[in-house]
């Protein structure tokens, strides 16, 4: 089975500087920033029925996101 996309948040990131859980690694500035400063995928409320934006990001396969994480399981890199 093909593995889904890697992400840039969190726990199992390679060293040297993994982001803490509330931060995301911003490739453009090359350091961790508050995830709220980036357009991170937002989980839908339970029962939400409104259609997703026409080109919002979606993984083709789940890769086992941790509890409470957004639609993409983002482990923070660097």
């Amino acid at each position: 089975m093909r593995r889904g996309p890697r992400s840039l948040r969190g726990r199992d990131a390679p060293a040297p500087t993994p982001c803490v859980p509330a931060e995301c690694f911003d490739l453009l500035v090359r350091h961790c920033v508050a995830c709220g400063l980036l357009r991170t995928p937002r989980p839908k409320p339970a029962g939400a029925s409104s259609p997703a934006p026409r080109t919002a990001l979606q993984p083709q396969e789940s890769v086992g996101a941790g509890a409470g994480e957004a639609a993409l399981p983002l482990p923070g890199l660097l």
């Epitope: 992400s7 490739l27 991170t40 993409l72």
Partner: antibody, heavy 118, light 111 residues
Framework: QVQLQESGPGLVKPSQTLSLTCTVS????????WNWIRQHPGKCLEYIGY???????YYNPSLKSRVTISRDTSKNQFSLKLSSVTAADTAVYYC????????????WGQGTLVTVSS | EIVLTQSPATLSLSPGERATLSCRAS??????????LNWFQQKPGQAPRLLIY???NRATGIPARFSGSGSGTDFTLTISSLEPEDFAVYYC?????????FGCGTKVEIK
Amino acid sequence: QVQLQESGPGLVKPSQTLSLTCTVSGDSITSGYWNWIRQHPGKCLEYIGYISYSGSTYYNPSLKSRVTISRDTSKNQFSLKLSSVTAADTAVYYCASPNYPFYAMDYWGQGTLVTVSS
Amino acid sequence: EIVLTQSPATLSLSPGERATLSCRASESVDNYGISFLNWFQQKPGQAPRLLIYAASNRATGIPARFSGSGSGTDFTLTISSLEPEDFAVYYCQQSKEVPWTFGCGTKVEIK
């Protein structure tokens, strides 16, 4: 749903400054990266630059000396200024925003054609 | 900057046929185990529409007939069976580093 809408003059005279504004709804420009891209008629897409959540900017080196991107957070708008325009700047100008973490531009304005002519 | 070269420039096919589009980067667009290569579809008078991100992941609402593959410098967009609405121009784009760059497109036209 995030929506972007470009606005500005469709005709600019040579040597003048092209000014466009992108109005964003459905998200705050204090989050993410907000970009300008242009497409010459029938040709490739050319990246112009961005303004970030912090207000920092990046300009494509090929246009850097003539480009300014700014923002008005109170109106949730960001703007493009391109100085000393020539006919070669005639293009469709798009504003767009990439999602995280893949920086793929999933939201685009509909584009606005700017013609440089006297 | 990273230069993206797309081939062929034009692909003439019939509905129902398979389309294979190529994008080659002047240097690797891989970073942190991710291929930062995206594919867009553009129809006349419209903005580009994101189809595939990170080389192989379909954006929301994109039909399963669209698939992407590749890593490093060589990437492919495949449309398994062309529908009438798929005739358009397709662009690849790298988001590994700024300036983000685009290929000059492959036009898929009706044969």
